[in-house]
Amino acid sequence: ATKLTEEKYELKEGQTLDVKCDYTLEKFASSQKAWQIIRDGEMPKTLACTERPSKNSHPVQVGRIILEDYHDHGLLRVRMVNLQVEDSGLYQCVIYQPPKEPHMLFDRIRLVVTKGFSGTPGSNENSTQNVYKIPPTTTKALCPLYTSPRTVTQAPPKSTADVSTPDSEINLTNVTDIIRVPVFN
């Protein structure tokens, strides 16, 4: 079995987690992709997913999570904006391929969000603040509700950094809604 590894990000409240999940172009370009959180001893929980079939460079927003699938690059870009302490946890990208079990994209992300001032004088994150200024048009998210029992039967051990994962649920709004937003440059 392939060893599960984690990449750790320590960010401040209000900042943006911005990661990219690499996938095999020929196999998965149009497959539906999802961003999941893994809580200790629980099955992975899907927080957001792309459309089915996944559209190229077409941003989908679910609460504070923005997914953008770049078929020509073979990358799923995931952004979690305006991070909160409760967002701390272990995350992964997966590709849905029913009836087979979801395909996990390496590596998992260990997110640690702490309180405190994130910037330096004059710093800004305009590209993420724009999310809240756009009148959204919403459609229902069609994320599969299942997760294969074989995908994760038990959450992996904590990383060597001894990061704690809070039990509280992630603070997302309108999780069932998809909000389309323009590409951020």
Epitope: E10, Q15, L17
Partner: antibody
């Protein structure tokens, strides 16, 4: 232990060619994007080229586009950089670097190989 | 292309003192910024990524802050082994990934 070992550098005339290799160990090579980063003598770092892991997508700096080709052999755990039509300004130490899975930042570097382009 | 500008070019500090290095991006890169340390004759070493996350094995005296366009690397109490050149790098979008021109931290 993660290790990256570059080879193939040397002295070449302008217009000539070289092929750099980077043999890696200590991680699942096929899963990770890899980049070449160069440093001209006494100068700063310049990203040259990247090849993604799963997708195999390739990218180049404008300064080398059309002249350099990045490739990888996952069965040999080796990354390559084919450099054609070399110019004097390509003279530099060339480093291969392993990237994070989740972003193009470089967590492990080789020791570098020196490419000198001179007549 | 996103241009990264570091200041100062050279910083003269006494051992035990605090060093503050700056990096500015020509446009917002969120927290997608890394810092590297390079000593003469050696390859660069990753210190900080995601603007503030210390890489594995990096001492706690190194800290990063900032977001958007303005970033800072702070070395709280300089040790003899910290005198080196430091580079920032943005990885916000697709290539090219750009580095700052470097800040040399030298002994005062």
């Amino acid at each position: 232990e993660v290790q990256l070992l570059e080879s193939g550098g040397g002295l070449v005339q302008p217009g000539g060619s070289l092929r750099l290799s980077c043999a890696v160990s200590g991680f699942t090579f096929s899963r990770y994007a890899m980049s070449w980063v160069r440093q001209a003598p006494g100068k700063g770092l310049e990203w040259v080229s990247e090849m993604r892991g799963s997708s195999g997508s390739t990218y180049y700096a404008d300064s080398v586009k059309g002249r350099f080709t990045i490739s990888r052999d996952n069965s040999k755990n080796t990354l390559y950089l084919q450099m054609n039509s070399l110019r004097v300004e390509d003279t530099a130490i060339y480093y291969c670097a392993k990237e994070f899975s989740s972003n193009s930042l470089f967590d492990y570097w080789g020791q570098g190989t020196l490419v000198t382009v001179s007549s | 292309e996103i241009v990264m500008t570091q200041s100062p070019a050279t910083l003269s500090v006494s051992p035990g003192e605090r060093a503050t290095l700056s990096c500015r991006a020509s446009q917002s890169v969120n927290a997608n910024l890394a810092w590297y340390q390079q000593k003469p004759g050696q390859a660069p070493r990753l210190l900080i990524y995601g603007a503030s996350t210390r890489a594995t094995g990096i001492p706690a005296r190194f800290s990063g802050s900032g977001s958007g366009t303005e970033f800072t690397l702070t070395i709280s109490s300089l040790q003899s082994e910290d005198f080196a050149v430091y580079y920032c790098q943005q990885f916000y979008n697709f290539p090219p990934y750009t580095f700052g021109q470097g800040t040399k931290v030298e002994i005062k």
